[in-house]
Interface confidence: medium
């Protein structure tokens, strides 16, 4: 067991040139507050997913109005420390998720208004007991610096914070076999308490004789790693020798949610479904009111004024769940066409549409030849989403504005020279040669395998390609 | 240390452009947060905020004199120009160019280091 | 706009005497953004005292700040020879900036 804290130092314009606009006006003043939620392991999960390391809300900041004319700076922050505490061991590796909120404090009807300024998200290493970890993350033009670190609670101690520590029983030192706890060197190793084998890398207790597994682990004793691989039992393959999980009580049996929480299975474990006035990640905390400020992603707060009486959330397009901590997946109806990118922004969504389409979802094929000129003669030819042009004799490229050189491609045969002219090539035959690539041999008596030379060249003349 | 340094032409006549310089150094306006104001004070009486510009070029007017003012900067030469046109013996005054400062602890800016200022008199 | 009226427009003290210079605004401005600038014959003002209260970098103790929403002080303890000058309000709350026509202290 043990704590994981936050400390935001400031959150403001980031560098850069666009500084944003101050988030709190004249007329509507306001202050900021901030939410952190923790997922164990270093997997990309999705922002709704269920903080299930644990989640914290801020103190409200001062009160700020913004001053014309300037661009906002730091804004004034809560004070205090963000506080997560975990109940089982500390998984090493985490991901967060920290969002600003404003709440405008103008006097619209309904009260105090919230809203999502920014949202950033990461992946992290940590070892419990560590020194603070300073990091700083960007937000569109937002900036926000923090430290962060996760500490054990007495008698835990370690990196995972699943070593318990008593106080000396003798003033000198420890007992056989018991270490002093660094850094209390007044305190030793408790003696071992947990299960007999339960693994020391992979597994911890906090009561005497059990033996609970960290994430990635299972068995009695926390040996056998979870297997992807496919298994015959429904729960997972049944042999050890396999590594694969054996079948046992599921994440749900007993249903681990209270207060009349509904239990589903998630593929790393169970996501608790809560009634509302009702969250946590086993539904175990109650008592919340709109002044808690419950909803998550600009939802609106509707009734609750009393711990004993039930808010409502009213979400904004693109969010649902009770606290509109859920982002609905608007793109997995494929809006958008002939093979368009679907971004959902939460506040609408868009289509990045492939070359050649266009239209909100990229519906319109668009004319590739419409307003595309070729330069020089070329004509323009349609085609997969892409124009090109066939260009006249002697240029090229993508508009036909580069001059060709109608010699690179050697196109005079048996040996005659190339010459570039204006309006194509001219090529020089060697003796014995004739015809406008100088591909036809002179016969030896004088006559050709040509009909009679035009008029005004004989036999050998460079001949015009035209 | 901060100096910044006003110029100008000293005399105009009515209706005539007034073209302003403040050259300054100690600090860039390319750096993020950083502006640059001007105001200015009539002989013996009161300030008059006129225009001030941003890192960022963002330019802020007074607004009784907007259609009148340009202000501008050039950051690689650490200046920062500003233009009043169809000036009138009511511009008469001591134009000061001032460094925009920041007080982390309020979260506010305000008006910090001032140049000497360069006086200029319309007369016809 | 926001219009600062400060008063008196002169005022003298003795050297040792309690001064206290007003500023009144003709609409509420948040204490963050109300300045003062101290500025003598001759030369450009100076930041005085920001945000109400905090006194610039090089300002002696004896001088101190005060006010809320539409009514600013500035006071000095002890008058001494070197505060004569003028004492300019400013305002950043509200948009334009605007300054009061200040106040000239004298020397008695």
């Known amino acids: 067991a043990g704590v994981f804290e936050l400390q935001i130092h400031s959150f403001g314009p980031g560098p850069g040139p666009g500084a944003p606009r101050s988030p709190c006006s004249a007329r509507l003043p306001c202050r900021l507050f901030f939410r952190v939620c923790l997922k164990p392991g270093l997997s990309e999960e999705a922002a709704e997913s269920p903080c299930a390391l644990g989640a914290a809300l801020s103190a409200r900041g001062p009160v700020y109005t913004e001053q014309p004319g300037a661009p906002a700076p730091d804004l004034p922050l809560p004070d205090g420390l963000l506080q997560v505490p975990f109940r089982d061991a500390w998984p090493g590796t985490f991901s967060f998720i920290i969002e600003t909120w404003r709440e405008e404090l103008g006097d619209q009807i309904g009260g105090p208004a919230w809203s999502l300024l920014a949202r950033v998200a990461g992946r992290r290493r940590l070892a419990a007991g560590g020194p603070w970890a300073r990091d700083i993350q960007r937000a569109g033009a937002w900036e926000l610096r923090f430290s962060y670190r996760a500490r054990c609670e007495p008698p835990a101690v370690g990196t995972a914070c699943t070593r318990l520590c008593r106080p000396r029983s003798a003033p000198s030192r420890c007992g056989p076999g018991l270490r002093p706890c660094a850094p209390l060197e007044d305190e030793c190793e408790a003696p071992l308490v947990c299960r007999a084998g339960c693994s020391p890398e992979h597994g911890f207790c906090e009561q005497p004789g059990e033996c609970r597994c960290l994430e990635g682990w299972t068995g009695p004793l926390c040996t056998v790693p979870v297997s992807t691989s496919s298994c015959l039992s429904p729960r997972g393959p049944s042999s050890a020798t396999t590594g694969c999980l054996v079948p046992g009580p599921g994440p749900c049996d007993g249903n681990p949610c209270a207060n009349g929480g509904s239990c589903s299975e998630t593929p790393r474990s169970f996501e608790c479904t809560c009634p509302r006035g009702f969250y946590g990640l086993r539904c175990e905390v109650s008592g919340v009111t709109c002044a808690d400020g419950p909803c998550f992603n600009g939802g609106l707060c509707v009734g609750g004024a009393d711990p004993d009486s039930a808010y409502i959330c009213h979400c904004p397009p693109g969010f649902q769940g009770s606290n509109c901590e859920k982002r609905v997946d608007r793109c997995s109806l494929q809006p958008c066409r002939n093979g368009g990118l679907c971004l959902d922004l939460g506040h609408a969504l868009r289509c990045r549409c492939r070359a050649g389409f266009a239209g909100p979802r990229c519906e319109h094929d668009l004319d590739d030849c419409a307003g595309r000129a070729c330069a020089n003669g070329g004509t323009c030819v349609e085609g997969g989403g892409a124009h090109r042009c066939s260009c006249a004799l002697g240029f090229g490229g993508r508009d036909c504005r580069e001059r060709a050189d109608p010699c690179a491609a050697r196109p005079c045969a048996h040996g005659g020279r190339c010459y570039a002219h204006f309006s194509g090539l001219v090529c020089a035959c060697a003796p014995g040669y004739m015809g406008a690539r100088c591909e036809f041999p002179v016969h030896p008596d004088g006559a050709s395998a040509l009909p009679a030379a035009p008029p005004g060249l004989r036999p050998g003349d460079p001949q015009r390609y035209l | 240390q901060v100096t910044l340094k006003e110029s100008g032409p000293g005399i105009l006549q009515p209706s005539q452009t007034l073209s302003l310089t403040c050259s300054f150094s100690?600090?860039?306006?390319?750096?993020?947060?950083?502006?640059i104001g001007w105001i200015r004070q009539p002989s013996g009486t009161g300030l008059e905020w006129l225009a001030h510009?941003?890192?960022?070029?963002?330019?802020y007017y007074n607004p009784s004199l907007k259609s009148r003012l340009t202000i501008s900067k050039e950051t690689s030469n650490n200046q920062v120009f500003l233009k009043i046109t169809n000036v009138d013996t009511a511009d008469t005054a001591s134009y000061f160019c001032?460094?925009?400062?920041?007080?982390?602890?309020?979260?506010?800016?305000?008006?910090?280091?001032w140049g000497a200022g360069t006086t200029v008199t319309v007369s016809s | 706009q926001i219009v600062l009226t400060q008063s008196p427009a002169i005022m003298s003290a003795s050297p040792g005497e309690k001064v206290t210079l007003t500023c009144s605004a003709s609409?509420?401005?948040?204490?963050?953004?109300l300045y003062w600038y101290q500025q003598k014959p001759g030369s450009s003002p100076k930041l005085w005292i920001y945000?109400?209260?905090n006194l610039a970098s090089g300002v002696p103790a004896r001088f101190s700040g005060s006010g809320s929403g539409t009514s600013y002080s500035l006071i000095i303890s002890s008058m001494e020879a070197e505060d004569a000058a003028s004492y300019f309000c400013?305002?950043?709350?509200?948009?334009?900036?605007?300054f009061g026509a200040g106040t000239k202290l004298e020397l008695k």
């Open positions: 001032v460094q925009i400062g920041r007080d982390y602890s309020n979260y506010a800016w305000y008006f910090d280091v």
């Open positions: 100690g600090f860039s306006l390319s750096t993020s947060n950083t502006g």
């Open positions: 510009i941003w890192w960022n070029d963002d330019k």
């Open positions: 609409s509420s401005v948040s204490s963050r953004y």
């Open positions: 945000s109400t209260s």
């Open positions: 400013h305002q950043w709350s509200n948009y334009p900036l605007t």
